[in-house]
């Protein structure tokens, strides 16, 4: 029986050759392609339901797209000797549902892990820490996607899903070097306090395609490094002086915030003057008023004092639930 | 499953002090502001103040700012409020509470009754 | 410091009737808003976050609704478990404030 990518093939991707051998360090796993060359593995839409344990130790890039994996359990990736090349992960579409604590221990090199767009009624606390301990080893992730990581309604457990994801972010401060954070389209309706204040390096951050009501009390103020803020496609009414003053103080940041049902009555007076003056926005020409009905589709740079008063009641559209 | 259970009924006299403990269990203490709220017999409720128990930086309502001093423990999941130079306006029941969306307390303990008398 | 005007202060309903709580901010509190219910004898239970979002497990029987200043909390069709005292709260600026309650009982 042939190996499929021990040393340097020719081709870049081997499909794998079924072995009734004990697996090689160097081996492709069933239904998975490889190549050495490219330090890379892809095991993509075989309805996998769980991580091949005979990965090759030279895989740098791993992809376990399009499977069936249902839950990933503590030291999913550990081998002996470990993956200490594995940098980036994508299990992206695998069904997952439930992700517990250590599923990612004994990958030291991990930086890139993306979990997009598997319905996870579990993440574990500890999934990214690794431990409970109140401080942990630093986690050595640099980039965490998980976009569309919400649940059916009938799936989710009597908790927030907010909290439960909130919980994995800032546990044991494991993820203190995490650049990129991409959590869009997930029905938040708010962050949990600090959860920022606990992810300092921060360069990137996509809330997009989420269901925020309110920035009120979420702290940018920590946020030193970030360069890019995705808040489009939420339902944000308003953004207060808190808020402004936090943003403008950020040096390098740029704020996306189309999209989003701006409320244009007395209260909207700050945050005008503000967008007027602002370099931080980026499309700000682009910002509409969507209530009261009397000011729907105005821009809001064109609105001055007079145009933004306050009626003693909004109509039921508004509501957000 | 969450629980916060707090500690005993307290009959004190005048002028003493108090300090009534609220034990957190099922969900990770240090990732949500507690609240502690008071009930006067009959009456609304009155929002005492918050404690983050991350770092123990407190958030109080005027009102109480001289009356009580909130605390963590970490180690034990546990957060205190002292109340301090007690009178009979003070007797009530008070009430610790987990925040779960930012502001709205979405657990609580089942109260400690504090009845200041001679 | 805000203070939460809640009206009325007491309400005799029968099962299956519709019931309307009223909520009026002393000023601006955009839609930090939040429902409470307090069983006798029993610690309140928050059943709607901001304005309008139902908390995990609350039937939805239970709405809220309104902006800035003005807040309705309506159950659709009384039961009799649902007899309790209902407060709001403002969570927008501290102090955060508490309504005076209003008390359902049954006719």
């Known amino acids: 029986t042939s190996s499929a990518s021990s040393s340097s093939s020719s081709a870049p991707f081997l499909a794998s050759a079924a072995s009734a051998q004990p697996p090689l360090p160097d081996q492709c796993p069933a239904l998975c392609e490889c190549s050495e060359a490219a330090r890379t593995v892809k095991c993509v839409n075989r309805n996998l339901t769980e991580v091949p344990t005979d990965l090759p130790l030279y895989v740098r890039n791993l992809f376990l797209t399009g499977n069936q994996l249902a839950v990933l359990p503590a030291g999913a990736f550990a081998r002996r000797p470990p993956l200490a090349e594995l940098a980036a992960l994508n299990l992206s579409g695998s069904r997952l549902d439930e992700v517990r604590g250590g599923a990612f221990e004994h990958l030291p090199s991990l930086r890139q892990l993306d979990l997009s767009h598997n319905p996870l009624a579990y993440l574990s606390p500890f999934a990214f820490s690794g431990s409970n301990a109140s401080i942990s080893a630093p986690s050595p992730l640099v980039e965490l996607i998980l976009n569309h990581i919400v649940p059916p309604d009938d799936k989710r457990q009597n908790r927030s899903f907010e909290g439960m994801v909130a919980a994995a972010l800032v546990a044991g401060r494991a993820l203190q070097g995490l650049h990129l954070l991409e959590l869009a389209s997930n029905h938040f309706l708010y962050l949990p306090r600090d959860v920022l204040a606990q992810l300092p390096s921060l360069r990137y951050l996509d809330l997009s395609n989420n269901s925020l009501v309110s920035l009120t009390y979420v702290s940018f103020r920590n946020l030193t490094h970030l360069e890019s803020l995705h808040l489009e496609d939420n339902a944000l009414k308003v953004l207060h002086n808190g808020t402004l003053a936090e943003l403008q103080g950020l040096p390098h940041v740029r704020v996306f915030l189309d999209n989003n049902p701006w409320v244009c009555d007395c209260h909207m007076a700050d945050m005008v003057t503000w967008l007027k003056q602002t370099g931080v926005v980026q499309g700000k020409d682009r910002l509409t008023c969507a209530f009261p009905e009397k000011m729907r589709n105005r821009v809001l740079l064109e609105l001055n004092s007079a145009d933004l008063d306050c009626d003693p009641i909004l109509p039921p559209s508004l509501q957000t639930s | 499953q969450v629980q916060l259970q707090q500690s005993g009924p307290e009959v004190v006299n005048p002028g003493a002090s108090v300090k009534i403990s609220c034990k957190a269990s099922?969900?990770?203490?240090?990732?949500?502001?507690m609240n502690w709220v008071k009930q006067s017999r009959g009456k609304s409720l009155e929002w005492i103040g918050d404690?983050?128990?991350?770092?123990?930086?407190?958030n109080y309502n005027q009102k109480f700012k001289d009356k009580a001093t909130l605390t963590v423990d970490k180690s034990s999941n546990t957060a205190y409020m002292e109340l301090r130079s007690l009178t009979s306006e003070n007797s009530a029941v008070y009430y610790c509470?987990?925040?779960?969306?930012?502001?709205?307390?979405?657990?609580w303990g089942q109260g400690t009754s504090v009845t200041v008398s001679s | 410091n805000i203070v939460m005007t809640q009206t009325p202060k007491f309400l005799l309903v029968s099962a299956g009737d519709r019931v309307t709580i009223t909520c009026k901010a002393s000023?601006?509190?955009?839609?930090?808003v939040a429902w409470y219910q307090q069983k006798p004898g029993q610690s309140p239970k928050l059943l709607i976050y901001?304005?309008?979002n139902r908390y995990i497990g609350v039937p939805d029987r239970f709405t809220g609704s309104g902006y800035g200043t003005d807040f309705t909390f309506t159950i659709s069709t009384v039961q009799a478990e649902d007899l309790a005292v209902y407060f709001c709260?403002?969570?927008?600026?501290?102090?955060?404030?508490f309504g005076g309650g209003t008390r359902l009982e049954m006719k």
């Open positions: 509470a987990k925040e779960g969306p930012p502001g709205a307390m979405d657990y």
């Open positions: 099922g969900y990770t203490f240090t990732d949500y502001y």
């Open positions: 404690i983050n128990p991350n770092n123990g930086g407190t």
């Open positions: 000023q601006s509190v955009s839609n930090h």
């Open positions: 901001y304005v309008s």
């Open positions: 709260q403002q969570v927008y600026s501290s102090p955060f404030t």
